[in-house]
C-alpha cells in the first residue's frame, strides 16, 4: 500500500502481506549481495554469520499470540528492523568505491530497496490492523509507538565484528520474515476465522 | 505547545570544541528520533547528524563523523550535539528538529529557532 | 549521495499568479511505492517549516494553494495562486538514504 492508503480488502491485503513476507525472507535480496559486498563470500567467514539466539522473536512465539499480538509484535519487530538496516546503510560503501573495486552495482541497489520495502511491508500491517480493529497500534509514519521494543544492542565500532553482526542480524532477519510467511498462511479466508 | 529551544551557540576559535542542547517540551520526546540540521548564513539547509529515539543509533554526514557525537537524555527531554576539532566552514546556525518517525527517517515536522555558532580565529 | 538541484534559484510572480518549483534528484528517491521527497519553507529570520511530505501529502495547516507532485528523480512544488506571505525560500528534501540532502533553495518573490 502507499503512504497513508488502506485497503478495505481483507483478502487482498493479507496476498499482499503474504507476497511481501515471501519476498524478505530469499536471502538473494539482503543477505547475499550483504555478504559479497562486505567481502564475507567465504567459506570460513560465511560459517561465523550465524542468526544471534533471540534477535527476534520465534516462529512458535509469532503462533502463540492471537492475530491482534501477532501484528503488534510484527509491527515492534519491523521497527527495529528499520533502524538496523539505516545503520548498515550508512556503512556500505559508496557506489564509486565498489565499481572501483569490481563489485556488482547491483548489489548495492538491493541493498538500499530493503527499508522501502520494509516499510511498505510495515503500512501493510498498520492497515491489517486497523482492519481487525486494533486501535492500539500507532500508524508507521506517524510518532508513537506500537509497542514496547526491547533495547537494541548498540553496534560495535570494530569493522569487522560490525559486517559479522549485520551478517548476523540479517540471517535472523530472512528466518524470522520467513516464520511471519508461516504464520500469514495460516489466517483464514476472512478476519473472523482462522485456519489451524 | 510543541517546542524545541536550542542553546550552546557562541564564538569559537578553530580546533575547538563546542557543545550544543536542545530542550524539547509539549511532547513524548522520548518518542521521536532527532536531528541536527544546519545553515551557514546566507545559504542553504544541511542535514547533520539523526538519533534514534532510544539513542541506540546514530547517523551523521560525512565531513562530521569523528568530530561531531549526537546524543540525548531521554529523561531530561535533551538532545546534544558535541562539536569538536571545530572548523571555519563549520559556522552555521544549527536547527534541533523532531523526525515524524520515530523508527526510522522520514521528514522533520518540528523545528527549533537555532543557534548560531561561529567558527573563527 | 544523491545532489538535489532545485530550480529556478529564484523566481518572480504577481500576486495570485501561479510560482512552479521543480527539483531533479541525481538518482530516483522513489522505492517501494513511496516518494522519499518533502518541501519547506523558510522566511527571513525563521526556521524551515514543512508544507509537503511523501512529494504530494499536504502538512496540516498548509493552505490548499500549496501542492506537490512527482516521483523518480523529478518533483515539483506548485503555488496556484501567490500570496504576499508566501514570499520565502523553499526547499526540497530527500529522506531515501543517508546523507539526507537538501535542494540549494528557490526564493519566491513579488513581482
Known amino acids: 500500500a502507499a503512504m497513508g492508503s488502506c485497503s478495505k480488502e481483507y483478502r487482498m491485503l493479507l496476498g499482499q502481506l503474504q507476497k511481501q513476507t515471501d519476498l524478505m525472507q530469499d536471502t538473494s535480496r539482503l543477505l547475499d549481495p550483504y555478504i559479497r559486498i562486505q567481502g564475507l563470500d567465504i567459506p570460513k567467514l560465511r560459517e561465523h554469520c550465524r542468526e544471534s539466539p533471540g534477535a527476534f522473536p520465534s516462529e512458535e512465539t509469532l503462533r502463540g499470540l492471537g492475530r491482534r499480538g501477532f501484528l503488534q509484535t510484527l509491527n515492534a519487530t519491523l521497527g527495529r528492523v528499520l533502524h538496523r538496516l539505516a545503520d548498515l546503510e550508512q556503512h556500505l560503501p559508496k557506489a564509486q568505491d565498489l565499481e572501483r573495486s569490481g563489485l556488482n552495482i547491483e548489489d548495492l541497489e538491493k541493498l538500499q530497496m530493503a527499508r522501502p520495502n520494509v516499510l511498505g511491508l510495515r503500512n501493510n500491517v498498520y492497515c491489517m490492523a486497523q482492519l481487525l480493529d486494533n486501535s492500539d497500534m500507532t500508524e508507521p509514519t506517524k510518532a508513537g509507538r506500537g509497542t514496547p521494543q526491547p533495547p537494541t544492542p548498540t553496534p560495535t565500532s570494530d569493522v569487522f565484528q560490525r559486517k559479522l553482526e549485520g551478517c548476523s542480524f540479517l540471517r535472523g532477519y530472512h528466518r524470522f520474515m520467513h516464520s511471519v510467511g508461516r504464520v500469514f498462511s495460516k489466517w483464514g479466508e476472512s478476519p473472523n476465522r482462522s485456519r489451524r | 505547545e510543541v517546542q524545541l529551544v536550542e542553546s550552546g551557540g557562541g564564538l569559537v576559535q578553530p580546533g575547538g570544541s563546542l557543545r550544543l542542547s536542545c530542550a524539547a517540551s509539549g511532547f513524548t520526546f522520548s518518542n521521536y528520533a532527532m536531528s541536527w540540521v544546519r545553515q551557514a548564513p546566507g545559504k542553504g539547509l544541511e542535514w547533520v547528524a539523526t538519533i534514534s529515539d532510544g539513542g541506540s543509533f546514530t547517523y551523521y554526514l560525512d565531513n562530521v563523523r569523528g568530530r561531531f557525537t549526537i546524543s540525548r537524555d531521554n529523561a531530561k527531554n535533551s538532545l546534544y550535539l558535541q562539536m569538536n576539532s571545530l572548523r571555519a566552514e563549520d559556522t552555521a546556525v544549527y536547527y534541533c528538529a523532531r523526525d515524524v518517525g520515530h523508527t526510522t527517517f522520514w521528514y522533520f515536522d518540528v523545528w527549533g529557532r537555532g543557534t548560531l555558532v561561529t567558527v573563527s580565529s | 549521495d544523491i545532489v538535489m538541484t532545485q530550480s529556478p534559484d529564484s523566481l518572480a510572480v504577481s500576486l495570485g499568479e501561479r510560482a512552479t518549483i521543480n527539483c531533479r534528484a541525481s538518482k530516483s528517491v522513489s522505492a517501494a511505492g513511496y516518494n522519499f521527497m518533502h518541501w519547506y519553507q523558510q522566511k527571513p529570520g525563521q526556521p524551515p517549516k514543512v508544507l509537503i511530505y511523501?512529494?504530494?501529502t499536504r502538512e496540516s495547516g498548509v493552505p490548499d494553494r500549496f501542492s506537490g507532485s512527482g516521483s523518480g528523480t523529478d518533483f515539483t512544488l506548485t503555488i496556484s495562486s501567490l500570496q504576499a506571505e508566501d514570499v520565502a525560500v523553499y526547499y526540497c528534501l530527500h529522506s531515501r538514504e543517508f546523507p539526507f540532502t537538501f535542494g540549494g533553495g528557490t526564493k519566491v518573490e513579488i513581482k
Open positions: 511523501w512529494a504530494s
